[in-house]
């Protein structure tokens, strides 16, 4: 029995920040769980982790090079990624594991979300404007 995960197919980070919502076919209320966000087609790099249980507040971990926060809904975890770099454009997969109460559950692999980080292109005013036309 696997948890299903829904993610937006694509998100664009115009201001180097993005909210990625992972929606689950499972209610996380009063559960001990570990939600994580993985970068790359092979999910090789785990970049953010949200750990929650019934007795203490949510704990959020960010891998070095990532600035991450997490928010819990009844059937969702939203990862808020800030200070993203253009080279962090990639596909990101949500993962969830529920440890307690039994049985242990995890998710079917989702389709992932492509996060496209747009660089900030400032248009400077020209230093030497050409001759103005009458």
């Amino acid at each position: 029995n696997k948890i299903l995960v829904k993610q937006s197919p694509m998100l664009v980070a115009y201001d180097n920040a993005v909210n990625l919502s992972c929606k689950y076919s499972y209610n996380l209320f009063s559960r001990e769980f570990r939600a994580s966000l993985h970068k790359g087609l092979d999910s090789a790099v785990e970049v953010c982790v949200v750990y929650g249980n019934y007795s203490q507040q949510l704990q959020v971990y960010s891998k070095t090079g990532f600035n991450c926060d997490g928010k819990l809904g009844n059937e969702s975890v939203t990862f808020y990624l800030q200070n993203l770099y253009v080279n962090q454009t990639d596909i990101y997969f949500c993962k969830i594991e529920v440890m307690y109460p039994p049985p242990y559950l995890d998710n079917e692999k989702s389709n992932g979300t492509i996060i496209h980080v747009k660089g900030k292109h400032l248009c400077p005013s020209p230093l030497f404007p050409g001759p103005s036309k009458p």
């Epitope: 785990e46 982790v49 750990y51 971990y61 070095t64 440890m99 307690y100």
Partner: nanobody, 124 residues
Framework: EVQLVESGGGEVQTGGSLRLSCAAS????????MGWFRQAPGKEREFVAA????????DYAESVKGRFTISRDNAKNTVYLEMNSLRAEDTAVYYC?????????????????WGQGTLVTVKP
């Protein structure tokens, strides 16, 4: 709830070796990291080494690189710290830590659970 039990500390001469072990028990997820920190008298607890579950990510403090090796046996939920070429400044209480982060974190605040500590004394 995770419990950590360290062993292997003791007294050794300068240049000697020790192997510390830390066994974890309790509810474990498929990915987590474990690390070693140490605290000398009157000093802050400092990072020594850490390793993730897949054993493809390990990190060391500069002061122990090339002398200490961290490893783990996932079947036994145990992490080891092999300490060679020990120096007087390695004398400290060594603590094992557990984090739900899936990478070898050197940040003390990332660690949720700690062992009781094991004393390592290096005699000149």
């Amino acid at each position: 709830e995770v419990q950590l039990v360290e062993s292997g500390g003791g007294e050794v001469q300068t240049g000697g070796s020790l192997r510390l072990s830390c066994a974890a028990s309790g509810r474990m997820f498929s990915n987590y990291a474990m690390g070693w920190f140490r605290q000398a008298p009157g000093k802050e607890r400092e990072f020594v080494a850490a390793i993730n579950y897949r054993r493809d990510d390990a990190d060391y403090a500069e002061s122990v690189k090339g002398r200490f090796t961290i490893s783990r046996d996932n079947a036994k939920n145990t992490v080891y710290l092999e300490m060679n070429s020990l120096r007087a400044e390695d004398t400290a209480v060594y603590y094992c830590g557990f984090t739900y982060a899936g990478w070898a974190s050197s940040r003390r605040d990332d660690y949720n659970y700690w062992g009781q500590g094991t004393l390592v004394t290096v005699k000149p």
